[in-house]
């Protein structure tokens, strides 16, 4: 977790002057109650905004807005802290709001937003906004809390950001898979513009079932620079086991930007059809 | 290929305790918190709470607060959540996922009966 | 906690039907909200998350949209493989919360 740039972030609006800080997402007021505090926050909103750095890359952010309630305690409020955790990694961030100013009610309701926080692809954040000073122990609550998903570099405006692209997000290998004769399978794909070997991972299953009955791994090392864009043909061998007929095939690139975590993609053949009547079995057995 | 295969299937008397393990493959196993969901016999699914891969940091729905236990084994990739003071009502099949907030991939399912 | 109220309770379609399922949140969850697609016996399987998008693997026959309260999740045209209970779940507040499902069985 990370903020976008280091400038100079701005929290300031007419009739409000503010500063935006670094936290360590424990405020004093946890340490040195105070008898008065706020209310929560109202109207949290999380979405997913994209921006760019002074360089230029593009990155998704957690674009947070939020509201104040229309009662007294805002007479009482002194800034907000804004915490980010990933959800898995239990890391947190944290900017405090600092109000340099006294707020006075105004004709319409105060709002907030802060765009800085860089989010990766494909991860699960809970965020949270606090009015400061926090409340005493015991006493109510003035956060508002919610969960914010991040898509995948699958997503379409996702796909071009720099974190993506950086994973191979713009590759299209456009796989192929064709059953042969004589249990074997032909794979094609369109190979990326870089010389980096690949890696096909053949795993098959049985018609209804999750559990692997093969597995096989296949090197394919760099292409030259005249064969970039163009397609590999490659004809994997399969176990000739019955009913092991469902493969999945996955090409992992070995791009230099991402090496052994790029985005793979896969294709899957599915086990061919049943016939709706089983053929009958010849009560004899032809000699020939 | 992203796998999660759980435990057997599991008969327990009223006030007993039970552990459903969870192992995972085919993924980094850090990446991804796990989360558990219950179904009753032909009812919906019911969240029960997930558990940080990365720390062990867990979070539990309310109801299941004091009862449930959702620890994790890096060295195995093996998710376990235990249920104690089991009661007739908590018969159900009890699934693993993957992840904390959208579910993307299942285990199979552990049938859990109570009954004297 | 948010209810999730989905609707019909249950629908008789046929192959190649264009089937339309709803959900509505109790309050509002922006767009933080999957579909799930489970078959008797088996586990549920995730169709589309945050509302919209289509998880990876999954049939482009399948859509959600929504924001706020109301969901929907459609599928263009009826696959017999689609016959199952459908499920949506909210997850921008804790704790997460499902829909009590919808059969879609065939006409």
């Known amino acids: 977790l990370r903020l976008l740039d280091h400038r100079a972030l701005v929290c300031s609006q007419p009739g409000l002057n503010c500063t935006v800080k670094n936290s360590t997402c424990l405020d004093d007021s946890w340490i040195h109650p105070r008898n008065l505090t706020p209310s929560s926050p109202k109207d949290l909103q999380i979405q997913l905004h994209f921006a760019h750095t002074q360089q230029g890359d593009l990155f998704p952010v957690a674009h947070i807005e939020w509201t104040l309630q229309t009662d007294a305690s805002i007479l009482y409020l002194e800034g907000a802290e804004l915490s980010v955790l990933q959800l898995n990694t239990n890391e947190r961030l944290c900017v405090r709001f600092e109000f340099l100013s006294k707020l006075r009610h105004h004709h319409r309701r105060w709002r907030f937003t802060f765009s800085h926080f860089v989010v990766d692809p494909d991860q699960e954040y809970e965020v949270t906004v606090h009015h400061l000073p926090k409340p005493i122990p015991d006493g109510d609550p003035n956060h508002q809390s919610k969960n914010f998903l991040v898509p995948d570099c699958e997503h379409a405006r996702m796909k071009v950001t720099t974190p993506c692209m950086s994973s191979g997000s713009l590759w299209d290998p456009n796989i192929t898979v064709e059953t042969l004769e004589a249990h074997q399978l032909r794979v094609s794909f369109t190979l990326w513009n870089e010389s980096t070997h690949y890696q096909i991972l053949l795993t098959s299953f049985p018609h209804m079932e999750n559990h692997s009955c093969f597995e096989h791994m296949h090197h394919i090392p760099a292409p030259r620079p005249e064969e970039f864009h163009q397609r590999s043909n490659v004809t994997l061998t399969l176990r000739n086991l019955k009913g092991c007929c469902r493969h999945q095939v996955q090409i992992q690139p070995f791009f230099s930007s991402c090496l052994n975590d790029c985005l793979r993609h896969s294709a899957t053949v599915s086990c061919p059809e049943m016939p709706d009547t089983p053929e009958p079995i010849p009560d004899y057995m032809p000699l020939w | 290929q992203v796998q999660l295969v759980q435990s057997g299937a599991e008969v327990k008397k009223p006030g007993a305790s039970v552990k459903v393990s969870c192992k995972a493959s085919g993924y980094a196993w850090t990446r991804y918190g796990i989360s558990w969901v219950r179904q009753a016999p032909g009812q919906g699914l019911e969240w029960m709470g997930w558990i940080s891969t990365y720390s062990g940091n867990t979070n539990y729905a309310k109801k299941f607060k004091g009862r449930v236990t959702m620890t994790t084994d890096t060295s195995t990739s093996t998710a376990y959540m235990e249920l104690r003071s089991l009661r007739s009502d908590d018969t159900a099949v009890y699934y693993c996922?993957?992840?904390?907030?959208?579910?993307?991939?299942w285990g199979q399912g552990t049938l859990v009966t109570v009954s004297s | 906690d948010i209810q999730m109220t989905q609707s019909p309770s249950s629908l008789s379609a046929s192959v190649g039907d264009r089937v339309t399922i709803t959900c509505r949140a109790s309050q509002s969850v922006h767009t933080g909200l999957n579909w799930y697609q489970q078959k008797p016996g088996k586990a549920p399987k995730l169709l589309i998350y945050?509302?919209?998008n289509l998880q990876s693997g999954v049939p482009s026959r399948f859509s959600g949209s929504g924001s706020g309260t109301d969901f929907t999740l459609t599928i263009s045209s009826l696959q017999p493989e689609d016959f199952a209970t459908y499920y949506c779940?909210?997850?921008?507040?804790?704790?997460?919360?499902f829909g009590q499902g919808i059969k879609v069985e065939i006409k």
């Open positions: 996922a993957r992840r904390v907030l959208r579910l993307d991939y």
């Open positions: 945050g509302a919209s």
């Open positions: 779940q909210q997850f921008e507040h804790n704790p997460l919360t």
